[in-house]
């Protein structure tokens, strides 16, 4: 005998790996928070599977997730954001696996935006600036940013700079002359809130000036 049940989908389903991961986004839509969960195994048959969150909620005991293709999603104002919630994968009334999670420790910030690079001829440097919606938020205000840049021809040679402000200066002498560069930025919660890196901002492309042969300096673009 194999030792495996042969009579029905639920018993077979219990042999599957229902590991899942989640991230929260606070004040992602006005004062609404969101919680997104997905299975770590992309091959899990999700047809009859639902997600439910219980505990550390305002006015209600539990909330059900909406299914959007292969992800599960809640948008609500009802997260208490103190203590742990119990997030369960369910088939009907049966819980297959659960995790206790503090939603303030799985925060994924919104991606930075409005990334731009301005060359300062007199200073021989590039001023990188970007914006983040978190400056206006009431919860997650303190972020660490990761600015990554590379020469366009160097596929995987990214240089990373971590900073807590939204402005960075790159010295011209640290970059190759007359080269096209790609730059992008992402953010992660810092301090009280914990969590994950945001998506990358859209990339910005800029060209460094050529070297002026007489002075050894770069020409402006």
């Amino acid at each position: 005998e194999s030792g495996y049940a042969q009579n029905g989908d639920l018993e077979d389903a219990e042999l599957d790996d229902y590991s899942f991961s989640c991230y929260s986004q606070l004040e992602v839509n006005g004062s609404q928070h969101s919680l997104t969960c997905a299975f770590e195994d992309p091959d899990v048959n999700i047809t009859n599977l639902e997600f439910e969150i219980c505990g550390a909620l305002v006015e209600v005991k539990c909330l059900n997730f909406r299914k959007l293709q292969e992800i599960y999603f809640i948008e609500t104002k009802k997260f208490l954001l103190i203590g742990k919630s119990n997030i369960c994968v369910k088939v009907g009334e049966k819980s297959l696996t659960c995790k206790k999670i503090d939603l303030t420790t799985i925060v994924k910030p919104e991606a930075p935006f409005d990334l731009s690079v301005v060359y300062r001829e007199g200073a021989n440097d590039f001023v990188v600036t970007f914006n983040t919606s978190h400056l206006q938020k009431k919860y997650v205000k303190v972020l660490m940013h990761d600015v990554a840049y590379r020469q366009e021809k160097d596929e995987n040679k990214w240089t990373h700079v971590n900073l807590s402000s939204t402005k960075l200066t790159l010295l011209q002498r640290k970059l190759q002359p007359a080269a096209m560069y790609e730059i992008k930025v992402r953010s992660i919660p810092d301090h009280y809130f914990k969590g994950f890196w945001s998506e990358w901002s859209p990339s910005y492309y800029f060209r460094t000036p050529e070297i002026n042969n007489s002075s050894g300096e770069m020409d402006p673009i």
Epitope: L81, I82, G83, K84, K100, D102, K137, K138, Y139, K141, V142, D190, H191, Y192
Partner: antibody, heavy 114, light 107 residues
């Protein structure tokens, strides 16, 4: 129910070190960050730092970086704080508290005196 | 570091009164602020978090308000057991910082 039980009062000499303990019960110890807070007699509260009991990762208030060492013993669900090179400025009540600040230990009084 | 300033070290009140304790942050902390009550010889007790959310079991005569840099803890219908020290705290940015405290005493 959640409880944080701290070690008893300590009388220590200047220049010495002391190790305070905070035993957690009523919850899964590794699931919650632990904070340590200092309160000098008749004064306000100062955050010393945090430790993640699941991996031992710490963050400190710069002011206490060279003063305090935070550790945990997962097997006994206990958090520890060692204070070194003690001076009279370190005489205070020290509290452990869970990250949400909803649960606090009863505090340990440390008196530094020759 | 963010400085939390409680302008009144002492506040006098009478049983049945309404009293407001204020706290000002040196920079914008959103609503990432908590209020604590502490009685002599006891540990601080969490009253309010997220600036206005009452902690479990805290009587509804305690109300928190404010956002950004200005925060208020209001106790309506003060009871004798409310006579204590009250501290505000920001937990938006490390190091977490507390106000110096306001002692609520009987007039």
């Amino acid at each position: 129910q959640v409880q944080l039980q701290q070690s008893g009062a300590e009388l220590v000499k200047p220049g010495a070190s002391v190790k305070l303990s905070c035993k957690a019960s009523g919850y899964t110890f590794t699931n919650y960050y632990m904070y340590w807070v200092k309160q000098r007699p008749g004064q306000g509260l100062e955050w010393i730092g945090e430790i993640n009991p699941s991996n031992g990762g710490t963050n400190f208030n710069e002011k206490f970086k060279s003063k305090a060492t935070l550790t945990v013993d997962k097997s006994s669900s206990t958090a520890y704080m060692q204070l070194s090179s003690l001076t009279s400025e370190d005489s205070a009540v020290y509290y452990c508290t869970r990250r949400s600040f909803a649960y606090w230990g009863q505090g340990t009084l440390v008196t530094v005196s020759a | 570091d963010i400085v939390m300033t409680q302008s009144h070290k002492f506040m006098s009140t009478s049983v049945g009164d309404r009293v407001s304790i204020t706290c000002k942050a040196s920079q914008d902390v959103g609503i990432v602020v908590a209020w604590y009550q502490q009685k002599p010889g006891q540990s601080p007790k969490l009253l309010i978090y997220w600036a206005s959310t009452r902690h479990t079991g805290v009587p509804d005569r305690f109300t928190g308000s404010g956002s950004g840099t200005d925060f208020t803890l209001t106790i309506s219908n003060v009871q004798s057991e409310d006579l204590a020290d009250y501290f505000c705290q920001q937990y938006s940015s490390y190091p977490l910082t507390f106000g110096a405290g306001t002692k609520l005493e009987l007039r």
